[in-house]
Interface confidence: low
Amino acid sequence: VPRWRQQWSGPGTTKRFPETVLARCVKYTEIHPEMRHVDCQSVWDAFKGAFISKHPCNITEEDYQPLMKLGTQTVPCNKILLWSRIKDLAHQFTQVQRDMFTLEDTLLGYLADDLTWCGEFNTSKINYQSCPDWRKDCSNNPVSVFWKTVSRRFAEAACDVVHVMLNGSRSKIFDKNSTFGSVEVHNLQPEKVQTLEAWVIHGGREDSRDLCQDPTIKELESIISKRNIQFSCKNIYRPDKFLQCVKNPEDSSCTSEI
């Protein structure tokens, strides 16, 4: 429900948001030669156009289409890593395993990662005071719609074996309400994706349970199987060792289960 004077329940737009987006874009296009044709000023203009002067509870995927077009990027479709509630480890992994990509390794994901933004209806102002919260205010807010849009496109692009990293320390290892559970799972294309392989990351050092048997993982398997995609699951008992072995696969201790 819109609040008087647009007082929303969530935090306001990230400080220096326009400068941050532009600077990230410049940095990304420098680091990724295949994206150096991207004009960052145009990217910012398209980003801004998606939410400025619009009611922050009435944003649509259509609003982001100009930005999606400018940020079109081809990543190897068989090298996609999805994640849910375990972003930091997923990013650490792709920093080491440079041929695999999370959404935040793409230009659009990189631009928006950890940022919040919203505008106000009929004014060109960015709202730095508060922005709509997904639960308490509305789901069609600028940030939620952005991530829904890019996540859908990212999942649609995937092929062959798709990996997903899941947090085994949470009560719901697979959460149907997460972006992975509500968007990405349903947008994997069965004609392109052969297998979804879940990596369940254990939190406790002494935790030797088979979390692939968790009821929520069985629920994920059921959803995936109904979509004619094969499912497999692996326990990552020691995430620290897992990363170390990705860095140094020749290490003798890396032959045992991690």
Epitope: L22, A23, V26, K27, E30, H37, V38, D39, S42, K69
Partner: antibody, heavy 120, light 111 residues
Framework: EVQLVESGGGLVKPGGSLKLSCVAS????????MHWVRQAPEKGLEWIAF????????YYVDKVKGRFTISRDNAKNTLFLQMTSLRSEDTAMYYC?????????????WGQGTTLTVSS | DIVLTQSPASLAVSLGQRATVSCRAS??????????MHWYQQKPGQPPKLLIY???NLESGIPARFSGSGSRTDFTLTINPVETDDVATYYC?????????FGGGTKLELK
């Protein structure tokens, strides 16, 4: 006021080496990619090399690859071009140029240039 | 490499008249609907100065008598009306593909 001041040019024999410098002021040097561009006497402009803000990405035109090295020292606001195995065709005015903030490859500020002459 | 061919090589125009410089690329310099073609002015003894970026955008501080147009392979820089201060050599540059390349230049003189 944005300023780029090149130095280090001079007369060098073929096969010799030289290091050019470009000191930047009036802007946050570490926020901008930088380029070297040269211009042979009475000729057109030729892009030579680019270095990104944190030096993670470096590009050269083929004819100088392996002979020229672009580098930067963000703490000292300085851009460098180390040139080795110099040839007579490297004779030119060498300009450092600042990369336009919002798009790779074009230049909003240039230095006044420093002259390199390669001759025996 | 993308080759940029400028024409004419030199141009003599009367004060107050229109000057038109052409730049033709050996392949398209467009990407995602943006033309990665830029124009510079260079006066004798001075470094080049950015006039137009991305085919038609006037750089800050450049007089409105300068304009750019074109897409894909064919681009035009127009100066209208020409003033005494415009005597210089004009270069086009593409940034769509490495290596970055410049045209050979067009020298503008007054009649």
């Amino acid at each position: 006021e944005v300023q780029l001041v090149e130095s280090g040019g001079g007369l060098v024999k073929p096969g010799g080496s030289l290091k050019l410098s470009c000191v930047a002021s009036g802007f946050t040097f570490s926020d901008y990619g930088m380029h070297w561009v040269r211009q042979a006497p009475e000729k057109g402009l030729e892009w030579i090399a680019f270095i990104s803000t944190g030096s993670s990405n470096i590009y050269y035109v083929d004819k100088v690859k392996g002979r020229f090295t672009i580098s930067r020292d963000n703490a000292k606001n300085t851009l460098f071009l180390q040139m080795t195995s110099l040839r007579s065709e490297d004779t030119a005015m060498y300009y450092c140029a600042r990369n336009y903030v919002s798009s790779y490859g074009y230049f909003d500020y240039w230095g006044q240039g420093t002259t390199l002459t390669v001759s025996s | 490499d993308i080759v940029l061919t400028q024409s004419p090589a030199s141009l003599a125009v009367s004060l107050g008249q229109r000057a038109t410089v052409s730049c033709r690329a050996s392949e398209s310099v467009d990407n995602y609907g943006i033309s990665f073609m830029h124009w510079y002015q260079q006066k004798p003894g001075q470094p080049p100065k950015l006039l137009i970026y991305r085919a038609s955008n006037l750089e800050s501080g450049i007089p409105a008598r300068f304009s750019g147009s074109g897409s894909r392979t064919d681009f035009t820089l127009t100066i209208n009306p020409v003033e005494t201060d415009d005597v210089a050599t004009y270069y086009c540059q593409q940034t769509n593909k490495d290596p970055l390349t410049f045209g050979g230049g067009t020298k503008l003189e007054l009649k």
